[in-house]
């Protein structure tokens, strides 16, 4: 059977006026997954995102990540979109005073 990912969105200061938002998916099986940032509901182009490899995490499951740089104050327009085994979920960027959003998608 399939094991749904745990999805975690974090933010970090990148440069003046910019932040990097990172979306990590972990503990999922099988390894096929879609992880991408969306702005105003639409997927960002490939060249504005950085992806990590899908790697085994040592428990027979996998992990990966995607990151993008955005303007500070625009965070709410962005969501991490995850698709795995026919299910999807969306994960917003937390406000500045909180850094984590964990969610099993099904």
């Amino acid at each position: 059977g399939s094991v749904p990912p745990m999805v975690n969105v974090t933010r970090s200061e990148a440069s003046e006026g910019n932040i990097t938002v990172t979306c990590r998916a972990s503990s999922f099986y099988p390894r096929n997954i879609t992880l991408t940032w969306r702005q105003d509901g639409v997927s960002l182009s490939h060249d504005t995102q950085q992806w990590g490899d899908v790697l085994p995490d040592g428990n027979g499951t996998y992990q990966t990540w995607v990151a993008t740089r955005i303007c500070q104050g625009e965070e709410q327009r962005f969501t991490c979109y995850m698709e795995h085994s026919g299910n999807h979920s969306t994960h917003p960027v937390p406000s500045g005073n909180s850094h984590h959003h964990h969610h099993h998608h099904h």
């Epitope: 509901g41 639409v42 709410q76 962005f78 299910n87 999807h88 909180s98």
Partner: antibody, heavy 117, light 107 residues
């Protein structure tokens, strides 16, 4: 102009199924998630689930996971919500809506489903 | 699931009145909150998103505020067309949940 046009009212028997359609126009259908919400008479709103029309991937409210099926037809820009094993408590207006990032910006006009023996 | 508690459930007001509706979430929703207006027999109409951003075409007498768990919709000077039911909705996590609604009636 973005428009979501839903199918007409339905009257169904308990135990049967209903399939409501939502035809999108005025935007790229496969780019945005379609959400489904219902509203029982005189009641609040309840989220049923969502579908990515591009891939067919779904996200269901646990409450509806066993009875609701969301599908989409890219060739006709139409999303569907099927609800099975209907009971009287399912009498409600069913809405589709477009998910614009982190809110619903456009809604269908609603489809009244009445479940009655 | 995040519960959304909206108050009051109904209120009576006159044209020109200032009206305030509140919504409290059972957990931090990070300002991922929308407000909708609904009239009988119609679908909800988006008024405010991200807690305080006014949707296109919405009159400036409407405003939203709040953060964390507590949010407010204010109508600065009630107009005849504002008599309707108002709902809040959180978008922080699924299942997306709504407040039970506030019916604004003519006094």
């Amino acid at each position: 102009e973005v428009q979501l046009v839903q199918s007409g009212a339905e009257v169904k028997k308990p135990g049967s199924s209903v399939k409501v359609s939502c035809k999108a126009s005025g935007y790229a259908f496969t780019n945005y998630l379609i959400e489904w919400v219902r509203q029982a008479p005189g009641q609040g709103l309840e989220w049923i689930g969502a579908i990515n029309p591009g891939s067919g991937a779904t996200n269901y409210n646990e409450k509806f996971k066993d009875r609701a099926t969301l599908t989409a037809d890219k060739s006709t820009n139409t999303a569907y919500m099927e609800l099975s094993s209907l009971r009287s408590e399912d009498t409600a207006v069913y809405f589709c809506a477009r998910f614009l990032g982190n809110y619903f910006d456009n809604w269908g006009q609603g489809t009244l489903v009445t479940v009655s023996s | 699931d995040i519960q959304m508690t909206q108050s009051p459930s109904s209120l009576s007001a006159s044209v020109g009145d200032r009206v305030t509706i509140t919504c409290r979430a059972s957990g931090n929703i990070h300002s991922y909150l929308a407000w909708y207006q609904q009239k009988p027999g119609k679908s909800p109409k988006l008024l405010v998103y991200y807690a305080e951003t006014l949707a296109d075409g919405v009159p400036s007498r409407f405003s939203g505020s709040g953060s964390g768990t507590d949010y407010t919709l204010t109508i600065s000077s009630l107009q005849p067309e504002d008599f309707a039911t108002y709902f809040c909705q959180q978008f922080w996590t699924t299942p997306y949940t709504f407040g039970q609604g506030t019916k604004v009636e003519i006094k």
